[in-house]
């Protein structure tokens, strides 16, 4: 706790001090205040700079004074023996003793008095800017007419600071101008424009004159111009040093004039004015901007279109243009938008095709669709190759946005019949000989599979299960090879309306329009054992010769057995229709006058007792195409026979071309379509 | 009528092997499929294996698999299983069936023969 | 290799009852199973294949449905003459799995 005075004895005093000594006082008189200290008595072993034994006074980090020896007054009509003035309030006194005295040495007495300071001349720095009041334990400034003591009490200015201009143009000039500006001062002025317009400031070099900068280059007395994080200044000298014309891209100005104690001058004089901000005429690639004008600025409007091929992406919604707005910061809206490259995406993948992964997608890309060659072929044309266009559509030149399309190739067996071992009647087949053949599980028959959903049978076949369980790609019919196989689930029969339908199938005489078609629930994957066989054209080269050779083949009766395990097949000449009427019917279930011949019927067979039989209904009579050899037709379907080796009949299909194309159409799928 | 007619009993002792004959009679053995099956006295039926003459293979169940060698003798009309390196627990009748078609698993069923494993 | 799982092991019934047998294959089979009747030193004898389709000669009163994993064969009203075993079989790939068997005994 701070006092005004006190006394302060060396150990045991006035009896001597003990060796091996050291205590310290903290003095303090509050504050304003100095401290008075003086010994009335001093009697400390001597020694060279008080090595040995000493008392110590210290006024912050300063050492005031170091005392040995014996001291008397000087002046009999004061005690005092040795003082010390300090304008601090704090002082330390420390005092010391070695370990051994030669003598009894009694040590010291001493007092302090607080006293006060005249902080306007006891000090180097002087602590006001104007003038310094002294009283006792303090002081105070004041300051000359028209100015203003500061916050921190010591300084003075003028009163220049607050003044908000608001108007779109107007003049600034330093305190008094062109009168000297005052010192110590600090005045700060702003400019708060409506926002989209920038502060402009025009100054004339001979209208600025301020205190010049010191040997360092710092102005003693400066000029700064503030918007936003943007400094311009600070300015001094004689004439203006900086751009006489300031454009400061902001709507908010602060003008801060500072000076110091010395050098005033006539200050400066400036002119501002409000511009609409200007955005920057940016080079945005791949567009084209409207309007087209020199330059643009605040509430600017322009229409920025992109050039073809290419898109502004805004999420995931791509547009050709977008507008963009001279803003009040002087910045475009939609700055971010950019006109892109179109990027047509990865390409749709097709069925029973491909498209090889583009090493681009974006406007101008290239890319090539191919089908499953040998077993799918590109049925819309266009040659599969699709460029990216402008509208981020992949286009074909011919088909223009509609994908390929990927259809079955028809007729062409992946391996040729021969007829190689001798088996009475026909021959061992493989499947890939006739990969259209489709089995029938019940009744136990074939069909012909003529493109992806389609499977063309006879009537007769599915007349009794319309509900068929169908299996394509093998030879044999063994259990576990169809387990292998595809099996084909139906969707729906349809049999030619003018089939007859009897009560009792088993006594039918009329076989006439024996066809049926199933459409399948699922499409028909193609390769090498499953394949379709076209269908013959509607000309007459279609129409067939007696003699005309076609193949049959099926997993029906053979001389052996019932039925065969493995793919029968043999290659049979069209006989006159007359021969199947000539033949016995074998098992006659009524007079032979009864069973009905038809144009709509093909005779075929009766060479080398090589003929279709029961279980190979349905099968197609295939024949090799007249317009392309490489290719087979079904130009019958097995039907019905009189005797088994001899001839048989088989569903002229030529005849019935309309009523399939009609019947698939009317029940495709959208996929198909 | 297609007829499968099996060999006749056989008594081994562990560790010797066994050779099954079944004879096709009413067809010819190319045109069909050999499986074979046994069933322990009071057990179950247990597929063995079979040839399949598509591939020109023989497959064998895992539990027999270098154990098991079917073969054909196409000339005679004659399958073949011999099963090596007996064990008590192979003992059980022994089954030669033909795989049917469209569907149908086994066909015609042999006699059986029944091949005893004792010391 | 594909298991197959049949239950019961055992079942007792008396004529004139309707009895279910299932089956549950390890993996999907679609409809390759078979159910077979076998009678103490006889062969066994198929009366359903493909899941459902019923053998020719076996009487109506057999009846199998089910496809992928789980099977079943119904014996709408037992008869003195089906008391026998029951085996189904998968046979979906060249590895043909029999069920370990379903004893149908008298009550």
């Known amino acids: 706790e701070p006092t005004m005075y006190g006394e302060i004895l060396s150990p045991n005093y006035p009896q001597a001090y003990p060796s091996e000594v050291e205590k310290s006082w903290d003095i303090e008189v509050p504050e304003g205040y100095g401290i008075h200290l003086y010994f009335t008595h001093l009697d400390i072993e001597l020694s060279e700079n008080c090595a040995y034994d000493s008392v110590q006074i210290i006024s912050g980090d300063t050492e005031e004074g170091r005392l040995c020896g014996q001291r008397s007054s000087n002046n009999p009509h004061s005690p005092i023996v040795e003082e010390f003035q300090v304008p601090y309030n704090k002082l330390q006194v420390i005092f010391k003793s070695d370990f051994s005295n030669e003598e009894r040495f009694t040590g010291f007495a001493a007092y302090y008095v607080a006293t006060d300071i005249n902080e306007c001349t006891d000090f180097v720095d002087v602590p006001c800017s104007h003038f310094c009041n002294n009283f006792i334990g303090g002081y105070f400034c004041s300051c000359p007419p028209e100015y203003f003591l500061h916050d921190d009490m010591k300084n003075c200015g003028v009163n220049c600071s607050g003044d908000v201009f608001t108007a779109l143009i107007g003049e600034i000039a330093s305190p008094n101008y062109p009168k000297p500006y005052p010192e110590n001062s600090r005045c700060e002025y702003q400019i708060r424009l409506e926002k989209g317009f920038q502060v402009v400031v025009t100054l004339r070099r001979e209208d600025f004159d301020v205190e010049a900068a010191d040997s360092a280059g710092n102005c003693l007395d400066s000029l700064v111009f503030v918007a936003g994080d943007r400094q311009f200044g600070p300015y001094c000298g004689h004439g203006f040093p900086g751009p006489l014309n300031i454009e400061t891209k902001s709507n908010a100005l602060d003008i801060i004039f500072q000076t110091d104690l010395t050098g005033q001058k006539k200050g400066w004089k400036l002119r501002y004015h409000g511009d609409p901000m200007p955005c920057p005429k940016e080079d945005t690639p791949n567009s084209v901007w409207e309007p087209a004008k020199a330059k643009y600025v605040f509430r600017d409007v322009v229409q920025i279109t992109c050039l073809d091929g290419f898109e502004v992406v805004e999420g995931r919604v791509g547009a050709t243009s977008f507008y963009s707005t001279c803003q009040s910061n002087g910045k475009w809206s939609n700055s971010k938008l950019k006109c892109q490259p179109v990027d047509c995406g990865i390409p749709e993948s097709i069925e029973n095709g491909k498209v090889e992964d583009p090493e681009s997608t974006l406007f101008g890309s290239v890319i090539r669709y191919t089908c499953e060659e040998p077993y799918y072929y590109m049925e819309n044309g266009g040659g599969g190759e699709y460029h990216c266009a402008g509208n981020g559509s992949w286009v074909n030149e011919v088909l223009g946005p509609e994908l390929p399309k990927c259809v079955p190739v028809c007729g062409v067996p992946r391996e040729p019949f021969e007829e190689k071992q001798r088996i009475i009647g026909g021959s061992d087949a493989d499947i890939k000989n006739f990969p259209w053949q489709v089995f029938f599980d019940n009744p136990w028959a074939g069909g012909a599979l003529i493109n992806e959903y389609w499977v063309l049978t006879a009537a007769h076949v599915v007349e009794g299960n319309r509900e068929p369980t169908m299996y394509v790609g093998s030879t044999s019919v063994q259990t576990s090879r169809l387990a292998k196989s595809k099996m084909l689930t139906p969707e729906h029969v349809f049999i030619h309306p003018g089939w007859k339908l009897l009560e009792v199938p088993e006594g039918r005489t009329n076989f006439d329009n024996d066809i049926a078609l199933v459409r399948l629930k699922d499409p028909v994957k193609m390769g090498p054992t499953v394949s379709p066989i076209c269908l013959p054209g509607t000309s007459s080269d279609y129409n067939l010769m007696d003699g005309d050779l076609g193949l049959i083949s099926g997993w029906g009766r053979t001389e052996k057995r019932d039925r065969a395990v493995r793919l029968k097949a043999a290659r049979l000449p069209v006989a006159p229709l007359r021969k199947c009427k000539e033949v016995k019917v074998e098992k006659p279930t009524a007079d032979a006058e009864a069973y009905v011949f038809t144009p709509n019927m093909i005779c075929a067979g009766g060479e080398k007792g090589m003929d279709s039989c029961k279980g190979d209904s349905g099968g197609a009579f295939a024949v090799q195409d007249p317009n392309d050899k490489t290719k087979f037709y079904a130009a019958g379907l097995v039907s019905w026979g009189p005797q088994c080796g001899t001839y048989g009949l088989y569903t002229r299909v030529k005849n019935y071309v309309d009523w399939i194309m009609k019947t698939m159409q009317e029940n495709s799928t959208p996929r198909e379509d | 009528q297609v007829q499968l007619v099996q060999s006749g009993a056989e008594v081994k002792k562990p560790g010797a092997s066994v050779k099954v004959s079944c004879k096709v009679s009413g067809d010819t053995l190319t045109e069909l499929s050999m499986h074979w099956v046994r069933q322990a006295p009071g057990k179950g039926l247990e597929w063995m294996g079979t040839f399949d003459p598509e591939e020109g293979e023989t497959i064998y169940a895992q539990k027999f698999q270098g154990r098991v060698t079917m073969t054909e003798d196409t000339s005679t009309d004659t399958a073949y299983m011999e099963l090596s390196s007996l064990r008590s627990e192979d003992t059980a009748v022994y089954y030669c069936?033909?795989?049917?078609?469209?569907?149908?698993?086994?066909?015609?069923w042999g006699q059986g023969t029944l091949v005893t494993v004792s010391s | 290799d594909i298991q197959m799982t049949q239950s019961p092991s055992t079942l007792s019934a008396s004529v004139g009852d309707r009895v279910t047998i299932t089956c549950r294959a390890s993996?999907?089979?679609?409809?390759?199973l078979a159910w077979y009747q076998q009678k103490p030193g006889k062969a066994p004898k198929l009366l359903i294949y493909k899941a459902s389709s019923l053998e020719s000669g076996v009487p109506s009163r057999f009846s199998g449905s089910g496809s992928g994993t789980e099977f079943t064969l119904t014996i709408s009203s037992l008869q003195p003459d089906d008391f026998a075993t029951y085996y189904c079989?998968?046979?979906?790939?060249?590895?043909?799995?029999f069920g370990q068997g379903t004893k149908v005994e008298i009550k």
């Open positions: 993996q999907s089979i679609s409809s390759w």
């Open positions: 079989q998968s046979y979906n790939s060249y590895v043909w799995t």
């Open positions: 069936v033909t795989e049917g078609l469209a569907g149908v698993p086994f066909d015609l």
